[in-house]
């Protein structure tokens, strides 16, 4: 496979990974196949350091994540585990709310206006964050 | 010159098998997805599948899905699309097209001029 | 799936007229919209990116507005090399994304 070692035009390098930040809205599944598509995945927040990174970028806008729980517990999409990671819900949150009245509950995490997380309806479009790290090699499937 | 150029179509009977190739010049090839749509006589343009830029992840569209395969070789600059168990309805011209994106963009900005795929007995 | 819809399916127009193409989406679709052309024989070329920006050399004389669910391509004096088949695709859902039927532009 080859290895990435720059950040693709449009990516904002920090920390060994590439960030990308979208300019407008998908709901959750879209924007998890866009960044894939990207060979990419949604931003996975390991850290306050991060955390503060990304806010810093968004700013006071609702923002996906790579964080979700609609297969049961909650998981980020490239493995990171969640029970023993770095979180930053608001408070009471999150609440699977079933009261919004679009059907089910809430299942996707996002960036709220203040940078804490919220649970919220994956159809919702919001922007969202691609990341991909540095130094890692993707791995070419051999053709058949 | 940015170019894409296909090949590989034909005449198969149904249920038979086919493997198309997009061989592609003038840009990193490695760094863009690639897609093939295509356009059944007289009719408009469907998009079929598409594949990351490093080949790990693919989607296809629900009318393929489990009969096509899409991959690409990077070293040799070329997309591929292997049709398997191929019925009337995908006689098409099948075009590659790549992706491009951009803070605002999201749209195919280059295309192929097609190649021929005629499924009949 | 989102399904497209362009009106009209074809139109006759002289050299010199202004013409109209709608797109409209079964859901908001956002400014997700591009337009290609394609003239017989030969793969699209897109003309129009998320809206309004116009793809590096295309005319001026080519314009798209909307947002939402209803967009528009104009063509605002219309030259012999613009008769061909317009189609308009949406890139909100990723990637499935979606083609309109297509709209031919034919000369009256």
């Known amino acids: 496979g080859s290895e990435r070692t720059c950040c693709p035009v449009n990516w904002v390098e920090h920390e060994r990974s590439c960030y990308w930040f979208s300019r407008s809205g998908k709901a959750w599944a879209d924007a998890d196949n866009y960044c894939r598509l990207e060979d990419a995945h949604l931003v996975v927040v390991t850290s306050w350091e991060e955390q503060k990174f990304v806010q810093h970028h968004i700013g006071p806008v609702n923002t996906w994540m790579g964080l979700h729980d609609q297969n049961g517990p909650w998981k980020w999409v490239d493995g990171t585990d969640y029970e023993t990671g770095f979180k930053n819900w608001r408070p009471e949150q999150p609440d699977d709310w079933y009261g919004h009245g679009l059907g089910g509950g809430e299942d996707c995490a996002h960036f709220t206006d203040d940078g804490r997380w919220n649970d919220d309806v994956c159809q919702r479009p919001y922007r969202w964050v691609c990341e991909t790290e540095l130094d890692k090699a993707s791995q070419e499937p051999p053709l058949l | 010159e940015v170019q894409l150029l296909e090949s590989g179509g034909g005449l198969v009977q149904p249920g038979g098998s086919l493997r198309l190739s997009c061989a592609a010049s003038g840009f990193t090839f490695s760094s863009y997805a690639m897609n093939w749509v295509r356009q059944a006589p007289g009719k408009g343009l469907e998009w079929v599948s598409v594949?990351?830029?490093?080949?790990?992840?693919?989607y296809y569209a629900d009318s393929v899905k489990g009969r096509f395969t899409i991959s690409r070789d990077n070293s040799k600059n070329t997309l591929y699309l292997q049709m398997n168990s191929l019925r009337a309805e995908d006689t098409a011209v099948y075009y590659c097209?790549?992706?491009?994106?951009?803070?605002?963009?999201?749209?195919?900005?280059?295309w192929g001029q097609g190649t021929m795929v005629t499924v009949s007995s | 799936d989102i399904q497209m819809t362009q009106s009209p399916s074809s139109l006759s127009a002289s050299v010199g007229d202004r013409v109209t193409i709608t797109c409209r989406a079964s859901q908001n679709i956002n400014n997700y919209l591009n337009w290609y052309q394609q003239k017989p024989g030969k793969g699209p070329k897109v003309l129009i990116f998320t809206t309004s920006s116009l793809q590096s050399g295309v005319p001026s004389r080519f314009s798209g507005s909307g947002s939402g669910t209803d967009f528009t391509l104009t063509i605002s004096s219309l030259q012999p090399e613009d008769f061909a088949t317009y189609y308009c695709q949406q890139s909100y859902t990723t990637p499935t994304w979606t083609f309109g039927q297509g709209t031919k532009v034919e000369i009256k």
């Open positions: 097209a790549k992706r491009y994106t951009s803070d605002w963009h999201d749209a195919f900005d280059i």
């Open positions: 594949i990351s830029g490093s080949g790990s992840n693919t």
